[in-house]
């Protein structure tokens, strides 16, 4: 189950981060890994593995840790200062337009096209027209050519916004 809010979504107007970590708020803000108490007088630690906060903040609660869905692998666990990092399993990818699920990468390019990019956790294989070199629009044809691709190795983790 993915959290629906990130601290970026909730971020108040930016203020300079206080330099010293203290148990009471500094300039009205609590350090990463904490949230502010109901009366605004204390900084309360987030619960490791359950919730987190990434920035100096005056949030009244910490944000829920993301749980990686089936079809995803956990690249790094949730800490009090950083959300879980999930990544699509090999052979699948997550598109910006449909970030809620990992989709299977195509196994090959349509007729008249050549593969120029591998399947990665954040992109499908990339196909271009043999002659023009222009990219394929993305719709998967009913019948694919036998040009196949092996799943690409991840270059860098795609961090879920939660």
């Amino acid at each position: 189950e993915s959290a629906l809010i990130t601290q970026q979504d909730l971020a108040p107007q930016q203020r300079a981060a206080p330099q010293q970590k203290r148990s009471s708020p500094s300039e009205g803000l609590c350090p990463p890994g904490h949230h502010i108490s109901e009366d605004g007088r204390d900084c309360i630690s987030c619960k490791y593995g359950q919730d987190y906060s990434t920035h100096w903040n005056d949030l009244l609660f910490c944000l829920r840790c993301t749980r990686c869905d089936s079809g995803e692998v956990e690249l790094s666990p949730c800490t009090t200062t950083r959300n879980t990092v999930c990544q699509c399993e090999e052979g699948t990818f997550r598109e910006e337009d449909s970030p809620e699920m990992c989709r299977k990468c195509r196994t090959g390019c349509p007729r008249g096209m050549v593969k120029v990019g591998d399947c990665t956790p954040w992109s499908d294989i990339e196909c271009v027209h043999k002659e023009s070199g222009t990219k394929h629009s993305g719709e998967v044809p009913a019948v694919e050519e036998t040009v196949t691709s092996s799943p690409g190795t991840p270059a860098s983790p795609c961090s879920l916004s939660g």
Epitope: S24, G28, F61
Partner: antibody, heavy 122, light 112 residues
Framework: EVQLVQSGAEVKKPGASVKVSCKAS????????MNWMKQSPGMSLEWIGR????????FYNQKFKGKATLTVDKSTSTAYMELSSLRSEDTAVYFC???????????????WGQGTLVTVSS | DIVMTQSPLSLPVTPGEPASISCRSS???????????LHWYLQKPGQSPQLLIY???NRFSGVPDRFSGSGSGTDFTLKISRVEAEDVGVYYC?????????FGPGTKVEIK
């Protein structure tokens, strides 16, 4: 347009319970606290408590603990307040109102429901 | 709990004239973060309250600039520079510096 639409007036007998609803629209329901206020006839306002739809935490005014129970149904963006063991002094107009998730801006209410009159009478 | 008092409790006004409402708190509303969490609402007849001013002097969006808030510590004032007929209703001050948040008794503004 942000709107909070509350359920209609209720008449209840002493000892009964009542559940008032507040349907939110025009904003992300899980992005704000939902607060509840009591306004007794000809009287001022009292803050009852608030519900956090994001993590389902509640925070009550000590005075209303045991009297009010706050819940939400995220699938319909509706907040509820149940009042139990009703007495004549619970007769009031009850308002829902939203507030921000931050301490610095969380203590005032930018949008309010139209109010629900609860009358307790034998 | 913090007790909020308002004066006057009733204020007859003349359209076009200024009006002023006072609000006092039983303790200072200056938070340890140096902000003051004192807010003003107007409840027009038959309506729900609407936010006018937050944190002493900040006008909420859409609130006419004839409304202004001032004050510090325990003493606060809401001023209407030129009262209009639509300004009638009950004005409440409210504090969120101390839990639980509390409201004043209200000041009823009506046209003379």
């Amino acid at each position: 347009e942000v709107q909070l639409v509350q359920s209609g007036a209720e008449v209840k007998k002493p000892g009964a319970s009542v559940k008032v609803s507040c349907k939110a629209s025009g904003y992300s329901f899980i992005g704000y606290f939902m607060n509840w206020m009591k306004q007794s006839p000809g009287m001022s306002l009292e803050w009852i408590g608030r519900f956090n739809p994001y993590n389902e935490d509640t925070f009550y005014n000590q005075k209303f603990k045991g009297k009010a129970t706050l819940t939400v149904d995220k699938s319909t963006s509706t907040a509820y307040m149940e009042l139990s063991s009703l007495r004549s002094e619970d007769t009031a107009v009850y308002f829902c109102a939203r507030s921000a998730y931050y301490f610095d801006s969380g203590g005032y209410f930018d949008y309010w429901g139209q109010g629900t009159l609860v009358t307790v009478s034998s | 709990d913090i007790v909020m008092t308002q004066s006057p409790l009733s204020l007859p006004v003349t359209p076009g004239e200024p009006a002023s409402i006072s609000c006092r708190s039983s303790q200072s509303l200056v938070h340890s973060n140096e902000n003051t969490y004192l807010h003003w609402y107007l409840q027009k007849p038959g309506q729900s309250p609407q936010l006018l001013i937050y944190k002493v002097s900040n006008r909420f969006s859409g609130v006419p600039d004839r409304f202004s808030g001032s004050g510090s510590g325990t003493d606060f004032t809401l001023k209407i520079s030129r009262v209009e007929a639509e300004d009638v209703g009950v004005y409440y001050c409210s504090q969120s510096t101390h839990v639980p948040w509390t409201f004043g008794p209200g000041t009823k503004v009506e046209i003379k």
